[in-house]
């Protein structure tokens, strides 16, 4: 009922409460003296539904039939007009329109942990739009019934608050649940299980790890379960995997021992638990435990390259380099390399640890035979030395290989094809591919990459530290016992015009031609490896074409002579450089004017 | 300290209604589930219904359908309504408090700390 009602009532038949599709009769009625003051004749009663007229009556009552209520609550106002007033409310009333509650289905109950407490849950069916009531029943052993009620709008869930415990676990208990609303109710079909079957185990805690004489060939996982846990399952990752090793347990009494676990390497561990075989549900996975596995000795030998460098007639310079061990391989930090260098035929040898570099640069006697022995150490121990015999790499022209070229494949990749040498193919142990940024000067701080072929491939695909814009120095080396062949070619994986183009810093006269001296492009300005130089002149105010003289670009050279111009003609002269992509912009301008004689 | 009194018994007819009532003092009421016995003569205490502290009811399968155990916090108050009585309901009913947690310990008499004096019932045919 609406407000107090005072001058009239409406009344609801069947129901306040209806199925969705039923049809109600509203009766709006005056209590006696309450229509308009004059003459109740000209009373008009209204019926609203919401703030819609639906119906109106001359009298004392009305009678409205109703149909196609939606689901939900519908406000009904009976109002009452009388000529020159303002329409005054008589009564309403709400009809609830809804539908019986659905068979609630899946009804399942679930413990955690053996002192956790019985709780289910069901899906509902569609909503009933009306306040339903679900009672939620557990009957178990010694005749005893628990029952719980929901107080709730949307109630898919009951905790009993109470705990099963596993004095006979194989007893059995029915669950049920039921939901009772004004227009029927309806029960879940009944839910039996066991205490197995519904405890689930709160998952294992106090998770550690032991390696037994710091070995991870002995490691042992610890942990805390619950007391009627039987099966445990362990899955443990390198902690930079996706990918999990599963293990299965069976009356593992909190312990585990692995025998599958990579040294030096980052593990995370979880387990699982469960009561029974084939009853009940595994636990949670517990929280991740983190643990580093202890160092073995390294495995594998170290790559190593090397450089020499002619310094003066009794001397030479050694420059070694070395890849580090991949993590699998090195089991552990790599505290230091140990190089041992030696004169094979006198028999001395000289030892040193390297920390912290990749490469080492000696000074030798350039008589004798010399080899490198090069390990890596961790806290456990070294690598197996690799050996290396130092020789004139590229002494044996017959070895070189030949038709070396340098192509562009892709973003920041270069390509590298060659044919075998002309001497024995076969003959070819591995080919080698080294590359450095090509820097005029040779500076040997420069860093060195190579990579080892096999004597079957006549190609290699180079990617490491390769920049765009930048020349690489790419030697290729066949290997044979104790010889080497190489052959060398200028390479880069992007290029475009130089920046800019060489500076003329001199030019001097000699004997009736002139010397252009230049100093390099910057490396940064290069734009990738240049081809040519040229050389332009023309005579000083003239508007005829410069004429040009084109110069193979070579690393080390920086002047060249022009004896085509005339004496005693004021030249100018500038310079560009090439790439294969085109033409710098010009260098300085130089005025030079020649001297000598005319021929 | 919880003490515990009934009231409410007496003598009915056969298929009649009772309601028992036990007050409570104390202000821990609501810390406690409450239960109610009853011993007939001749026979040991009886475990007959329960309401947990989270309100979940308990009835023993005999009495289930015909007797509703309730509880009033704010008036710690706990009452057993008893429809469709029968002669061998008559017995002496106790109220009881306790903190039973399992499945099991709620009908051992061993869970209740505190008990009422009792009240009698007696259903003639």
């Known amino acids: 009922k609406i407000d107090a009602c005072k001058r009239g009532d409406v009344t609801v038949k069947p129901s306040h409460v209806i199925l969705l599709g039923s049809t109600v009769n509203i009766t709006c009625s005056l209590k006696p003296r309450q229509g308009c003051f004059h003459y109740s004749r000209r009373n008009k009663l209204i019926l609203y539904k919401f703030d819609r007229r639906i119906n109106f009556h001359h009298g004392h009552s009305l009678n409205s039939q109703v149909t196609g209520l939606p689901l939900g609550t519908t406000l009904f106002v009976c109002k009452l007009a009388c000529i020159n007033s303002d329409e005054i409310q008589i009564c309403g009333a709400e009809i609830f329109v809804g539908v019986a509650p659905e068979q609630p289905q899946n009804l399942s109950c679930i413990q955690k942990g053996e002192q956790g407490t019985v709780a289910c849950t069901w899906e509902r069916g569609r909503d009933t739009h009306l306040y339903t009531e679900y009672t939620l029943q557990l009957s178990g052993p010694k005749n005893l019934t628990w029952q719980k009620q929901c107080k709730d709008i949307y109630c898919d869930y009951l905790d009993f608050g109470i705990n099963l415990t596993p004095e006979s676990p194989e007893s059995n208990f029915t669950a049920k649940v039921t939901a009772v609303n004004s227009l029927g109710s309806s029960s879940s079909l009944p839910s039996t299980f066991t205490f197995l079957d519904i405890v689930r185990p709160l998952p294992p805690w106090d998770i550690r790890i032991k390696f037994q004489k710091a070995s991870v060939s002995r490691c042992t996982l610890y942990w805390r379960d619950e007391g009627l846990v039987l099966l445990n399952r362990l899955r443990y990752r390198p902690s930079n995997s996706r990918l999990w090793n599963m293990v299965n347990v069976t009356k593992a009494k909190g312990r585990h021992d692995l025998l599958d676990l990579k040294p030096f390497t980052e593990y995370e561990f979880q387990i699982s638990s469960k009561l029974h075989l084939y009853k009940g549900s595994w636990s949670d996975w517990s929280e991740s435990l983190r643990a580093q596995t202890p160092e073995e000795e390294p495995t594998g030998m170290l790559d190593v390259w090397y450089m020499k460098r002619h310094i003066d007639y009794s001397r030479q310079q050694i420059s070694l380099f070395w890849k580090n061990l991949s993590v699998s391989e090195a089991r552990g930090k790599i505290l230091h390399y140990q190089v041992t260098l030696q004169e094979l035929t006198g028999g001395k040898a000289m030892t040193q640890n390297i920390t912290g570099h990749t490469s080492w640069t000696t000074v030798i006697p350039r008589t004798g035979n010399w080899a490198v022995a090069v390990s890596a150490a961790n806290s456990k121990g070294s690598s197996l030395p690799t050996r290396i015999n130092i020789m004139n790499l590229c002494e044996a022209g017959l070895l070189a290989p030949r038709q070396v070229s340098a192509n562009s494949e892709g973003m920041d990749n270069i390509l590298v094809t060659w044919q075998p040498p002309r001497k024995d193919p076969s003959a070819v142990q591995e080919y080698v591919v080294e590359w450095r940024e090509l820097h005029p000067g040779g500076d040997t701080q420069v860093p060195l990459n190579w990579l080892r072929s096999r004597p079957y491939n006549v190609s290699a695909l180079i990617s490491e530290n390769i920049k765009s814009y930048i020349c690489y120095e790419i030697r290729v080396y066949a290997l044979s016992g104790d010889q080497g062949g190489c052959s060398s070619i200028l390479g880069n994986s992007k290029h475009k015009a130089p920046l800019s183009g060489p500076h003329i810093n001199a030019i001097t006269e000699e004997k009736g031609s002139i010397l252009i001296s230049w100093n390099s492009i910057p490396v940064q300005e290069q734009m990738g490896c240049l081809l040519h130089y040229r050389i332009y002149w023309k005579e000083r105010d003239s508007n005829s074409q410069p004429q040009l003289c084109e110069i193979p670009y070579r690393v080390s050279q920086n002047s060249h002579p022009i004896n085509s111009l005339q004496p005693r003609v004021t030249y100018v002269l500038w310079m560009t450089a090439l790439t294969a992509a085109g033409e710098s912009s010009h260098g300085n301008e130089r005025e030079f004017c020649l001297q000598g004689k005319a021929n | 300290q919880v003490q515990l009194q009934e009231s409410g018994g007496g003598l009915v007819q056969a298929g009649g209604s009772l309601r028992l009532s036990c007050a409570a003092s104390?202000?821990?009421?609501?810390?406690?589930?409450m239960a109610w016995f009853r011993q007939a003569p001749g026979k040991e205490r009886e475990f007959i219904a329960a309401?947990?502290?989270?309100?979940?009811?308990l009835y023993i399968d005999s009495v289930k359908g015909r007797f509703t155990i309730s509880r009033d916090n704010a008036k710690n108050t706990v009452a057993l309504q008893m429809n469709s009585l029968k002669p061998e309901d008559t017995a002496v009913y106790y109220c009881a408090a306790g903190m039973p947690y399992s499945y099991s310990d709620y009908p051992r008499d061993s869970k209740y700390d505190y008990w009422g004096r009792g009240t009698q019932v007696t259903v003639s045919s």
């Open positions: 309401i947990t502290r989270s309100d979940t009811t």
């Open positions: 104390g202000r821990t009421f609501n810390n406690y589930a």
